[in-house]
């Protein structure tokens, strides 16, 4: 039985092998209960976290990873030396950035040790799976009298990056969003003195070193408006 | 083994135009986004250009954009740069690297750019 997984992360070519053992029709061998489904993230391209649902196991099973890269120099399969747990039953396997290859194809499988038939195999595109830090050092620098532009780090090259900024007045119940590119700048053409915005940015490893679908987390929140600082009206920057 | 290999600089005035191109081989070039950077006497590398492994994407330095462009050929396993408009900042020792620049693997041998009058 060869079933293609979907996977959430633009793996379409995500591929799993199930290996069925010979049973007789009145009863299910174990081999034949599918294995959690692996999902890895690449985090700021320093390590990888590859993780299943350990709690869907029929019975608390302490599952094998191994990995390795196809067609490669790397094509020599690994074990999994830093496995994560949950509730003392292996829930993932943590590889550290040495092991991380972004653009060959990433081959992992899961096994489990009391039916070595019984395992799936899935090929990732690591690229796809970068999730950068949130963006950091957000600050505001009004341009003139109407109008800010919002600048901040990340802790990636710029380049390999897109980011969506949010903003919104306390009058406001929604978010307004703009998406920015590599360059890292927004700018807000016509603020309103009266009121208090908040901004706030997340990013994504897209579109040119990767086509990952996930954003980071959003970066701490930073406002300006109506309470802001007297001292200097032209730069402020105030996290939440 | 991954080989680079960049070549077409040379001599050009204030104004003037070059076409570097960098041949690869030793690993699946159109998997990877590719790099162009650069260093200046007495300067440390800077990057300059990446684009995505289809071609489809591209970025560049702010000191460098609307004069050059980069693009490559999958088929042929070879990237280039086209650089317009030189300035005599832009002399420097241009190289080529497998990825997005973040210094490893380390760049090709190289091909020197002088902008002079």
């Known amino acids: 039985l060869n079933t293609t997984i979907l996977t959430p992360n633009g793996n379409e070519d995500t591929t799993a092998d199930f290996f069925l053992t010979t049973m007789p029709t009145d009863s299910l061998s174990v081999s034949t209960l599918p294995l959690p489904e692996v999902q890895c993230f690449v985090f700021n391209v320093e390590y990888m976290n590859c993780t299943w649902n350990s709690s869907s196991e029929p019975q608390p099973t302490n599952l094998t990873l191994h990995y390795w890269y196809k067609n490669s120099d790397n094509d020599k399969v690994q074990k999994c030396s830093h496995y994560l747990f949950s509730e003392e039953i292996t829930s993932g396997c943590q590889l550290q950035k040495k092991e991380i290859h972004l653009y060959q194809t990433f081959v992992v499988q899961l096994q489990d040790p009391r039916e070595p038939r019984r395992q799936a195999t899935q090929m990732l595109k690591l690229q796809n799976l970068v999730i950068p830090w949130a963006p950091e050092n957000l600050t505001l620098h009004k341009l003139s009298e109407s109008q800010l532009e919002l600048n901040w780090n990340n802790r990636f090259l710029n380049h390999c990056l897109e980011h969506l900024v949010q903003y919104r007045t306390d009058w406001d119940h929604s978010w307004t969003e703009q998406s920015v590119d590599y360059r890292h700048k927004f700018s807000l053409p016509s603020v309103d003195g009266q009121k208090r915005y908040t901004f706030r940015v997340r990013s994504r490893f897209n579109p040119l070193c990767g086509s990952a679908q996930h954003w980071s987390e959003w970066s701490h929140p930073i406002h300006w408006g109506s309470n802001t600082s007297k001292e200097n009206p032209f730069l402020f920057a105030l996290e939440a | 083994q991954v080989q680079l290999q960049e070549s077409g600089g040379g001599l050009v005035q204030p104004g003037g135009s070059l076409r570097l191109s960098c041949t690869a081989s030793?690993?699946?070039?159109?998997?990877?986004?590719m790099t162009w950077a650069r260093q200046a006497p007495g300067k440390g590398l800077e990057w300059v250009s990446t684009?995505?492994?289809?071609?489809?994407?591209?970025a560049y330095a702010a000191s460098v954009e609307g004069r050059f462009t980069i693009s490559r050929d999958n088929a042929k396993s070879t990237l280039y740069l086209q650089l317009n408009s030189l300035k005599t900042e832009d002399t420097a020792m241009y190289y080529c690297?497998?990825?997005?620049?973040?210094?490893?693997?380390?760049p090709g041998q190289g091909t020197q750019v002088t902008v002079s009058s």
């Open positions: 030793g690993f699946s070039f159109s998997s990877y986004p």
């Open positions: 684009i995505a492994s289809d071609g489809g994407s591209t």
């Open positions: 690297t497998k990825g997005y620049g973040d210094g490893t693997p380390a």
